[in-house]
Every structure is written in structure tokens, then in C-alpha cells.
């Protein structure tokens, strides 16, 4: 029960986290104009990974996409890449984890398979969360560097061109969304990995047990995995516990016609 709860909670937390990573990646407010100690302007600038926007006091907002790839800073490209990798891994992790959930039965999937899938999705969530946190942190570092550079030189004259007020940018809402979302995805992934341990068949060696079916011998090797003929429903690796006790989730397996081919 605790394993199911841990797995379910891990899935939900990761789902929220990945939704947050997607939201952060799409948001325009990665960096926002710093209003502290600045002349009060009737224009508010903010930038995202994909476009920059200007909101006028009049209420009009104009956004312009970055229609160049080569002209963009390498750091911005790296952040984009990290966020996309995070989303892709997270999405695959979600897909895998849906099939791994104990509360969902798909055919005759075994606990060991579900355990492996849970672990896989958990690792994917952890990597996804780390990608998001890394991406947001790289962007934040870029902002801090630029902030102090522009503070040192508030007004710049570009090679004889017209002076422009050096707009300083500070952390936007997307950074905080990204950090929180990355953290949630990471936590969700850890929870999935913990749940995997509870789902996985124990590796302890048990006494060899023989079960004699009429006309056919099926041996149970130490380690508890059934050596079957490789056909039909009996190919499932069922765990035999001492005294023949089974877990409540385990369905008894009877010899089928395929065992006697």
C-alpha cells in the first residue's frame, strides 16, 4: 500500500513539475526590466527564451520573436536545449510511469517489469528536473553577470550611434517557476526510485522448492525465479516464497496446455 502511494505521489509530483517546466519554457518573463533605482519609464521590457516583449503604460504589448538562430548568444541556446531536453525526458518518463503504476493493470505485466519501468521513469524525472534547474540557473547566472556589467555602465554610446538608456534586467517569474518545477520533478523522480525498491522482487536466496506436475517437471531454482519452457502464460517470472505464501497481488499460476507441448 505504501509503495503504491509513494509511486502515485511521485507520479503526480513529477506531472506537476513537468507541467511547470513546460510553462516556464514558454513564458516570456525570464528576465524583466529592473525598476529599482531606475528612472521611472512608461515602458516595461521583458524577455523570454523565444521572444522579447515591451509593455507600454497605454496597455499595448508588443512581442518580437528571435527569428535568428546564429545571432543568438550561445548561453541562450544552451538554456533552450536544456529546457527542451528536460521536457522531452519528462514526457517520456510520464509515459513510462503511467504503465508502471501499480494501480493500473496492463495485461499480465509482472511486478519486476513494473519495478524496472518505475526506476526508468524515476531516473528520467531526476535528469529532467536537473536539466530544468541547470537551464534556469545558467540563465540566472547570465542575468547576474549582465546586471553588474550594465550597472557599471548605465549609459552606453554604441560606436557613434545614438545613446540608449542601458536597460538592466533582473530575474523574471519564469525563473522561479522553473526552479520550483525542476525541484518538483526531481523530488517526483526520487519518489519513483524509492517506490521501485518496494516493487522489485527481493534478491534473497530461498530454499529450492520442487513442484511436480503430472507428466512434466517444473523446477524452481534458488533465487526464486521459475525456469519455464518459454511458452505461454507460464513465461511469467513468478516468485515462490517459503511455505508457498504469495503476495496479495500475485495470481496463482496453473500449468497450461503449452507446458505439455
Amino acid at each position: 500500500m505504501a509503495v503504491t502511494a509513494c509511486q502515485g505521489l511521485g507520479f503526480v509530483v513529477s506531472l506537476i513539475g513537468i507541467a511547470g517546466i513546460i510553462a516556464a519554457t514558454c513564458m516570456d518573463q525570464w528576465s524583466t526590466q529592473d525598476l529599482y533605482n531606475n528612472p521611472v519609464t512608461a515602458v516595461f521590457n521583458y524577455q523570454g527564451l523565444w521572444r522579447s516583449c515591451v509593455r507600454e503604460s497605454s496597455g499595448f504589448t508588443e512581442c518580437r520573436g528571435y527569428f535568428t538562430l546564429l545571432g543568438l548568444p550561445a548561453m541562450l541556446q544552451a538554456v533552450r536545449a536544456l529546457m527542451i531536453v528536460g521536457i522531452v525526458l519528462g514526457a517520456i518518463g510520464l509515459l513510462v510511469s503511467i504503465f508502471a503504476l501499480k494501480c493500473i493493470r496492463i495485461g499480465s505485466m509482472e511486478d519486476s517489469a513494473k519495478a524496472n519501468m518505475t526506476l526508468t521513469s524515476g531516473i528520467m524525472f531526476i535528469v529532467s528536473g536537473l536539466c530544468a534547474i541547470a537551464g534556469v540557473s545558467v540563465f540566472a547566472n547570465m542575468l547576474v553577470t549582465n546586471f553588474w556589467m550594465s550597472t557599471a555602465n548605465m549609459y552606453t554610446g554604441m560606436g557613434g550611434m545614438v545613446q540608449t538608456v542601458q536597460t538592466r534586467y533582473t530575474f523574471g517569474a519564469a525563473l522561479f517557476v522553473g526552479w520550483v518545477a525542476g525541484g518538483l520533478t526531481l523530488i517526483g523522480g526520487v519518489m519513483m526510485c524509492i517506490a521501485c525498491r518496494g516493487l522489485a522482487p527481493e534478491e534473497t536466496n530461498y530454499k529450492a522448492v520442487s513442484y511436480h506436475a503430472s507428466g512434466h517437471s517444473v523446477a524452481y531454482k534458488p533465487g526464486g525465479f521459475k525456469a519455464s519452457t518459454g511458452f505461454g502464460s507460464n513465461t511469467k517470472n513468478k516468485k515462490i516464497y517459503d511455505g508457498g505464501a504469495r503476495t496479495e497481488d500475485e495470481v496463482q499460476s496453473y500449468p497450461s496446455k503449452h507446458d505439455y507441448v
Epitope: 512608461a42 515602458v43 507600454e56 503604460s57 497605454s58 538608456v165
Partner: antibody
Framework: QVQLQQSGAELVKPGYSVKLSCKAS????????INWVRQRPEKGLEWIGW????????KYNENFKGKATLTTDKSSSTAYMQLSRLTSEDSAVYFC???????????WGQGTLVTVSA | DIVMTQSPSSLTVTAGEKVTLSCKSS????????????LTWYQQKPGQPPKLLIH???TRESGVPDRFTGSGSGTDFTLTISSVQAEDLAVYYC?????????FGAGTKLEIK
């Protein structure tokens, strides 16, 4: 078409208050800010402040804080400016104008002449 | 506050002449975010409210004759009337729309001979 209809001329005694109105028509009142501008005789234009009818957000020129109070009534699509503690210096024509691209003022009311005299 | 300096303060011209009105701001009105200059030109005829001619320093408002052209960037701006007509008799104001408080120039009075 867009129209801003302002209230009629006012003759006020010094120290008193006056409330000017600006009724908007021809557009969605809550979507655009309303600015107020003062023009004194033989003087230029002075921006007083703006109000967004949608959420009531205001921004004032520091020189008019405490002097002007901007409000709106969404039901009647009307913007108001109350001028308090009037002096002869406040005698002027007051315009309301709708915010537009580039923070410019696109549609103007016809103006309200306020005369402060004992 | 941003000071908007207009020159000349008044100007007398004959119909058909080309006129250039100047406006200088004490600080740049160029926004780095969208590379637009937040300067507006208005025309005020006697007994009327001001009328918007040009916003963003060079974007002509719809319905404004194309003889009116705005140019300039940063701190120096000009309004050019390519061929002055009798109906252009008015006071022309420039406005800072970038910094609060939004400030106007003292105006240039255009008179026709």
C-alpha cells in the same frame, strides 16, 4: 466613432473643489487608459495623470499628487477628475484623452474651462 | 523631469514652403527593448484640443496627410511639413512618452503669411 465628451465650464471659489467628467463612447471603455492634461492660458500642456478603468490603476504626475484625484464609473463609461484646494493657478482648460500606441494620446475631449475666482 | 526643448518658438512661412520643426529631449527616448523612440507630435489649432499627428517619432497616425513626416532618434527629433497649407496654422507640440512624468515641449507656433 470614438468620442470623449467633457462636462461644461466651471467657476469655482478659491479653496473649494471641483469634479470634472469625461464620458467615453465608441470603444470598450475598460480597455484603454484615460489621461488628463492641463493647459493654462498662454502656457503649454501639462500631463496630470492617467487611470485605467478596467482595474482602477492610476499614475500621477508628482506635481499633481494631492491636487488631482482620478476615478471612473464603468457603468456609465465616465472618467472623473476631482481638483481640490483650488487656487488661481489652477485656472486652466482641462482635457481628457485616450491612451494609444507609443503612450500617445489619440482622442481628446473638447476641454473643460475651470476658472478659480473669488 | 525630462525637459523637451522646441525650436523655433514661432515660425512664419508662406504656403507651399517646406518647414522643419525641432524638438530635443534632455534624455534619450529610445527604448532598447524594441528600438522605438517614445516621442509624439501633436497639432493644436486655435480653440481646439490637440490632435495626434505622429507617435513613435515617425509613425504617422491614420488620416494625417503624408506631408507630415517625423524623424530623429535618441534626443534629437524633427517634424517636417513638406508643403505647408493654410490649414496647417497651429501650435505643434512634441511629447516625451518614455519617462514619467510625461512631458510636453513649449510648442512651436506656425503662422502663415
Amino acid at each position: 466613432q470614438v468620442q470623449l465628451q467633457q462636462s461644461g465650464a466651471e467657476l469655482v471659489k478659491p479653496g473649494y473643489s471641483v469634479k470634472l467628467s469625461c464620458k467615453a463612447s465608441g470603444y470598450t471603455f475598460t480597455n484603454f487608459g484615460i489621461n488628463w492634461v492641463r493647459q493654462r492660458p498662454e502656457k503649454g500642456l501639462e500631463w496630470i495623470g492617467w487611470i485605467f478603468p478596467g482595474d482602477g490603476t492610476t499614475k500621477y504626475n508628482e506635481n499633481f499628487k494631492g491636487k488631482a484625484t482620478l476615478t471612473t464609473d464603468k457603468s456609465s463609461s465616465t472618467a472623473y477628475m476631482q481638483l481640490s484646494r483650488l487656487t488661481s493657478e489652477d485656472s486652466a482648460v482641462y482635457f481628457c484623452a485616450r491612451f494609444y500606441y507609443g503612450n500617445s494620446f489619440v482622442n481628446w475631449g473638447q476641454g473643460t474651462l475651470v476658472t478659480v475666482s473669488a | 523631469d525630462i525637459v523637451m526643448t522646441q525650436s523655433p518658438s514661432s515660425l512664419t512661412v508662406t504656403a507651399g514652403e517646406k518647414v522643419t520643426l525641432s524638438c530635443k529631449s534632455s534624455q534619450t527616448l529610445l527604448n532598447s527593448g524594441n528600438q522605438k523612440n517614445y516621442l509624439t507630435w501633436y497639432q493644436q489649432k486655435p480653440g481646439q484640443p490637440p490632435k495626434l499627428l505622429i507617435h513613435w517619432a515617425s509613425t504617422r497616425e491614420s488620416g494625417v496627410p503624408d506631408r507630415f513626416t517625423g524623424s530623429g532618434s535618441g534626443t534629437d527629433f524633427t517634424l517636417t511639413i513638406s508643403s505647408v497649407q493654410a490649414e496647417d496654422l497651429a501650435v505643434y507640440y512634441c511629447q516625451n512618452n518614455y519617462f514619467y512624468p510625461l512631458t510636453f515641449g513649449a510648442g512651436t507656433k506656425l503662422e502663415i503669411k
